[in-house]
Amino acid sequence: AGHLEQPQISSTKTLSKTARLECVVSGITISATSVYWYRERPGEVIQFLVSISYDGTVRKESGIPSGKFEVDRIPETSTSTLTIHNVEKQDIATYYCALWEV
């Protein structure tokens, strides 16, 4: 079974800079999985942001600001990255990755 690890416990960024969050997949080939990213803001329900499927297809939640989030997959390091552009106050949250095995 696949296992996920988010090595960064926290990430502090200056306003308007870029944040990159990592999710390391083990126990399964990342190319055979879909990785989903979610955000939980204080006081709000957890929200789907973006996913990258086993075939590389990217799906974004409607209503998420365009150009704000970018998702990628690096097979060599078995890692999925979530890039948050133009970091601002509304981006303060806990971000989770999740796995769906094909």
């Epitope: 502090t12 306003l15 308007s16 709000e44 601002e88 106050k89 509304q90």
Partner: antibody, heavy 124, light 107 residues
């Protein structure tokens, strides 16, 4: 001195349009989320709209959704509210307000700097 | 939409009195609550945020408590400049909603 100054209010007929402006000084405008809050004559405060520092996140009250548009120009230290299809119930003093800032130690919400407001009257 | 209900709607008090205003939320908002003071024909002023954190420059006679759905603003010893209207506001959820206000006037 940290200051917000609104302008653009006036008398307009129902169905008409107005564009409010808010000029900021004394702080790094581009680092702060901004808000519009209105107060009808003799009534309480009503939140109207918010915009995040880089304009990625925009929110509206249901009462103005589809009619009002919030925007900002960080290069000009300015916040705007485009008001279309105005109704009598939009008559109010409109304040722009700054959201509490963010530090590496904490973040909270709340509006810590307010302008004196500009008056919008919608009447035939 | 979260409805914020303040009580009382008005209170008459004297200088030196202790005054408590209550704000109730229609659903839990953790500690995401702010209190404002507004003098007639003036802009509101932030007093307290995060339910109990005093804004810089606000006198220590003002205090906030509560979490979840019930919150209080207390003025321990009312001063002449404290006669005003007080509003609570939640920022747990969009839309940000205010209470209807509590007027503190002179007895």
């Amino acid at each position: 001195e940290v200051q917000l100054v609104e302008s653009g209010g006036g008398l307009v007929k129902p169905g008409g349009s107005l564009r409010l402006s808010c000029s900021a000084s004394g702080f790094t405008f581009s680092n702060y989320d901004m808000n519009w809050v209105r107060q009808a004559p003799g009534k309480g405060l009503e939140w109207v709209s918010s915009i995040s520092s880089s304009s990625s996140y925009i929110y509206y009250a249901d009462s103005v959704k589809g009619r009002f548009t919030i925007s900002r120009d960080n290069a000009k230290n300015s916040l705007y509210l485009q008001m279309n299809s105005l109704r009598a119930e939009d008559t109010a003093v409109y304040h722009c307000a700054r959201d509490v800032g963010v530090t590496t130690d904490y973040y909270y919400y709340g509006m810590d700097v307010w302008g004196q407001g500009t008056t919008v009257t919608v009447s035939s | 939409e979260i409805v914020m209900t303040q009580s009382p709607s008005s209170v008459s008090a004297s200088v030196g009195d202790r005054v408590t205003i209550t704000c109730r939320a229609s659903q839990g908002i953790n500690s995401w609550l702010a209190w404002y003071q507004q003098d007639p024909y003036k802009a509101p002023k932030l007093l307290i945020y995060a339910a109990s954190t005093l804004q810089s420059g606000v006198p220590s006679r003002f205090g906030g408590r509560g979490s979840g759905t019930e919150f209080t603003l207390t003025i321990s010893s009312l001063q002449p400049e404290d006669f005003a209207v007080y509003y609570c506001q939640q920022y747990n959820n969009w839309p940000r909603t205010f209470g209807q206000g509590t007027k503190v006037d002179i007895k």
